[in-house]
């Protein structure tokens, strides 16, 4: 089961007028910039087989992976959003940075390896799609963790 | 083509049963959120329920909880809303709509069934 | 539950006019809300999702905007096929809910 009291953020985090809004501005950009419709990253399937309680650390992970190796290598797009949400969603990475779950945690670590091989397999447009994607992102944190 | 065809609407007297079906066709249909959204004569939209593609998370309109079940067949590709304890307001023409996900708007319709209640 | 009020709830127009429809959510529903045409006898249609993407299938005389609590649906040049009912929806949380439409009339 999860240290539950590490995998939580305060509600407040989410109710900050001006940075969510320029959160959800990011991913309508980038959104308009993704041609393949096809594909869901954030979706019912990322949940397959993880418990309510599990999910908070389920999105850190996914949470991480999209500060590392999606928004960071593309810092320099989307301006002038992009420089103000990158911290914004870095801080919560960092709130979540002791949210660790007890026990075994590979059927979560199995449902992220599919979320990560899609955007790879992608390649850049498996990244636009991602920030185009924080708007679920956003709310699956909220959900989850709050 | 995406299809949703309800079915299984009609009169019932008000404390009786009623279950309704909606045949789809056209998407893969475990992928998506399904929903029932109903409509009184002459009066606006409500949405009633919604069951996730797996069929494990369910939602209801508090105007209906413990009243009404929603289900799914993913194997028939058939979603149902059993009925129960009807009461005049659930009058209604019942629309089954679907959605991707949570966060997702409803994209396509049935073109309803209705229900009347009444003695 | 999240309430969603909408205005006007009857709205007479002359073909060519821009007409304008507002919603409004008793919370922050960030960008979760969608507009739906509706004619009699008929399945409402999406027309609008995310406050401002145009549904595949919808006329581009259609836009939506806003954020939040407040959001507008404009029609741009009104044809003969726009006259018929709207709803907004908040798919923000569980339960979902409509506004109570806007029948739009000819003048």
């Known amino acids: 089961a999860p240290i539950s009291s590490h995998c939580r953020l305060d509600k407040s985090n989410f109710q900050q007028p001006y940075i969510t809004n320029r959160t959800f501005m990011l991913a309508k950009e980038a959104s308009l910039a993704d041609n393949n419709t096809d594909v869901r990253l954030i979706g019912e399937k990322l949940f397959h087989g993880v418990s309510m309680s599990e999910r908070c650390y389920l999105m850190k992970q996914v949470l991480n992976f999209t500060l590392e190796e999606v928004l960071f290598p593309q810092s320099d797009r989307f301006q002038p959003y992009m420089q103000e949400v990158v911290p914004f969603l870095a801080r919560l990475s960092n709130r979540l940075s002791t949210c660790h779950i007890e026990g075994d945690d590979l059927h979560i670590q199995r449902n992220v390896q599919k979320l990560k091989d899609t955007v790879k397999k992608l390649g850049e447009s498996g990244e636009i799609k991602a920030i185009g994607e924080l708007d679920l992102l956003f709310m699956s944190l909220r959900n989850a963790c709050i | 083509e995406v299809q949703l065809v309800e079915s299984g609407g009609g009169l019932v007297t008000p404390g009786g049963s009623l279950r309704l079906s909606c045949a789809a066709s056209?998407?893969?249909?475990?992928?998506?959120?399904m929903s029932w959204v109903r409509q009184a004569p002459g009066r606006g939209l409500e949405w009633v329920s919604a069951?996730?593609?797996?069929?494990?998370?369910?939602y209801y309109a508090d105007s209906v909880k413990g009243r009404i079940t929603i289900s799914r067949d993913n194997a028939k590709n058939s979603l149902y809303l059993q009925m129960s304890s009807l009461r005049s307001e659930d009058t209604a023409v019942y629309y089954c709509?679907?959605?991707?996900?949570?966060?997702?708007?409803?994209?396509?319709w049935g073109r309803g069934t209705l229900v009347t209640v009444s003695s | 539950d999240i309430q969603m009020t909408q205005s006007p709830s009857t709205l007479s127009a002359s073909i060519g006019d821009r007409v304008t429809i507002t919603c409004r959510a008793s919370?922050?529903?960030?960008?979760?809300l969608a507009w739906y045409q509706q004619k009699p006898g008929k399945a409402p249609k999406l027309l609008i999702y995310?406050?401002?993407s145009l549904a595949s299938g919808a006329p581009s005389r259609f836009s939506g905007s806003g954020f939040g609590t407040d959001f507008t649906l404009t029609i741009s040049s009104l044809q003969p096929d726009d006259f018929a009912t709207y709803y907004c929806?908040?798919?923000?949380?569980?339960?979902?809910?409509f506004g109570g439409g806007t029948k739009l009339e000819i003048k």
């Open positions: 709509a679907r959605g991707l996900w949570v966060w997702d708007p409803l994209d396509y």
């Open positions: 056209g998407f893969t249909f475990s992928d998506y959120y």
């Open positions: 069951i996730s593609g797996s069929g494990g998370s369910t």
């Open positions: 919370e922050g529903i960030y960008h979760w």
């Open positions: 995310k406050a401002s």
């Open positions: 929806q908040q798919y923000s949380e569980f339960a979902w809910t």
